[in-house]
Amino acid sequence: QDSRGCARWCPQDSSCVNATACRCNPGFSSFSEIITTPMETCDDINECATLSKVSCGKFSDCWNTEGSYDCVCSPGYEPVSGAKTFKNESENTCQDVDECQQNPRLCKSYGTCVNTLGSYTCQCLPGFKLKPEDPKLCTDVNECTSGQNPCHSSTHCLNNVGSYQCRCRPGWQPIPGSPNGPNNTVCEDVDECSSGQHQCDSSTVCFNTVGSYSCRCRPGWKPRHGIPNNQKDTVCEDMTFSTWTPPPGVHSQTLSRFFDKVQDLGRDYKPGLANNTIQSILQALDELLEAPGDLETLPRLQQHCVASHLLDGLEDVLRGLSKNLSNGLLNFSYPAGTELSLEVQKQVDRSVTLRQNQAVMQLDWNQAQKSGDPGPSVVGLVSIPGMGKLLAEAPLVLEPEKQMLLHETHQGLLQDGSPILLSDVISAFLSNNDTQNLSSPVTFTFSHRSVIPRQKVLCVFWEHGQNGCGHWATTGCSTIGTRDTSTICRCTHLSSFAVLMAHYDVQEEDPVLTVIT
């Protein structure tokens, strides 16, 4: 109890009436008007409640506060009087705010602001629409994906901000008179090949395709390892080189190094480099055969396989490269005795003679060219004395009828070891690779070591066997005549040739042995 007669226990938001009673403050109410016990409370009266007598008037909102209330203008409206709050309708001066005037950038870049009572809307510019999640924000309409298909099928649609373009597809161009961009654009395929707009490598030929182009290897060329054919970035290499690789199953560092050189020469090969490339290959071969290194430690049969592979490949490579030479006669010789003679001509009707240190070859020009082949005619002769090392003890396989005849009359005499190579090994080739049956024979004159008296001299060629190796054979070759250090041979095909000395005695006037000649 207060000495002044006022209760000290009055609840919050109340005041004492006397020493035993309290009353709620204005804006608060309790269960009974006079509070006589401390357990009672004073609660805020919500003047803004629906049944309340308070009326703020139009364009305004009532805001309840602790023990009171405020009238405020609704969003989008403001009081003319400037007073932010008021208590009743008579004090209400709320009127609409023109947001568009207040903030001209309200609709950002792509909309026009339109004022409404208490608010505003954004009217989007052509090519824009209101964003569903933010109806005040205009966003670009993608005409290309909206299903309108506004462009011709020969073009592709490019969406722009607020617009779109119909552009020619890559590899296409506007048809004459057509623009490139508006929705009436119509395009046609560009022939990149004839217009020179392609990026094909010089090792390929350009082929136009609809809307694009592809690059295909030139005839006689193949795609570089790992690069597909018929692509824009196809790069090819001359098959002349790519097929001449070490024979399978032969392990020789010396041989690998030779073939590495061949592949290096082929990597950036161009037709204009033919002369230098031929010389470099023969230089490398000359060095290989001068110092065969670990090739000499291989079993004899493997050495014969290597020789066979080298002879076969060399012929193909020289034939391929020679077609890129200009007309004329070429002669190259190398330290270890390798020699090349080449004649390149537009086809002429005469015989050709190629002369070398140890061999001469004569044949008709008309053999050189395959009919219908537009390239130049090439006749070539390579002497490869170093090949003799690899062909030591190579077998001689006679035709069955010759073999049988000899077997009947000279039993056991041919078992007397392998024939001896008397001459350099030579390889003859033409631009025409179909040389298995010449229409007129080729004549070779070999210079060679002295013949041991009463030994048989044979004109032979190297026959590449099915197994990739080979042997000496006489089929299609005949010995026209022989002196102590020279022999004339005539053959009806081209390959690699030599003169052998057979290991048996020749009987005087032996009719059987004349069969061989």
Epitope: R257, D260, R267, S280
Partner: antibody, heavy 118, light 106 residues
């Protein structure tokens, strides 16, 4: 006799381009690749690339991809090397050299000094 | 790319002495070439295809090697031989040079 005559010295600003020429004489222009090699002051030799005059085919190092253009004019037996977007580290003597795989670069131009400075 | 490492970087010798320069490749190389360069001058081809002397090169120079290891030798140094020598491979693109060996007078 074989001769390779290069264009004169150039001073360029960073970002600019330079085009160096190399006129060949005394041999068949299409029988060799023409190589481009550069040498920065006090440094070693650096291969830029090569052009084959016969068909305009080129080879170049990845380092210069997109910046170097090598061309050949058969009518004047001249090759060109253009280097764009120059930076100070492109300051060097630029050489052209006749080349073939098995022979190396057997004839060299006298060199063209390109200075890149702001 | 094939990296060529030349050693030593500098070789200090007196005239009459033997100089041996080496060039080591990160992969096997078939065609190795050597060039001589003197200050302010263009390089000159000196040895090509491992061991062949370029025209006008005296026979006191020689080259050898195969695979990844190559050697350039000057049998008896003459005053005009003091220069920088570069090896260069042509077995794969890009073509690469060694960083050079400077042969200087001791």
């Amino acid at each position: 006799q074989v001769q390779l005559q290069q264009s004169g010295a150039e001073v360029k600003k960073p970002g600019a381009s330079v085009k160096v020429s190399c006129k060949a004489s005394g041999y068949t222009f299409t029988n060799y690749w023409m190589q481009w090699v550069r040498q920065a002051p006090g440094q070693g030799l650096e291969w830029i690339g090569a052009v084959y005059p016969g068909d305009g085919d080129t080879r170049h190092t990845q380092k210069f991809k997109g910046r170097v253009t090598m061309t050949a004019d058969k009518s004047t037996s001249t090759v060109y090397m253009e280097l764009s977007s120059l930076r100070s580290e492109d300051t060097a003597v630029y050489y052209c050299a006749r080349g073939f795989t098995a022979y190396g670069m057997d004839y060299w131009g006298q060199g063209t000094l390109v200075t890149v400075s702001s | 790319q094939i990296v060529l490492t030349q050693s030593p970087a500098t070789l200090s010798l007196s005239p009459g002495e033997r100089a041996t320069l080496t060039c080591s490749a990160s992969s096997s190389v078939s065609y190795m070439h050597w060039y001589q360069q003197k200050p302010g001058l263009s390089p000159k081809r000196w040895i090509y295809d491992t061991s062949k002397l370029a025209s006008g090169v005296p026979d006191r120079f020689s080259g050898s090697g195969s695979g990844t290891d190559y050697t350039f030798t000057i049998r008896r140094l003459e005053p005009e031989d003091f220069a920088t020598y570069y090896c260069q491979q042509w077995s794969s693109n890009p073509l690469t040079f060694g960083q050079g060996t400077k042969v200087e007078i001791k």
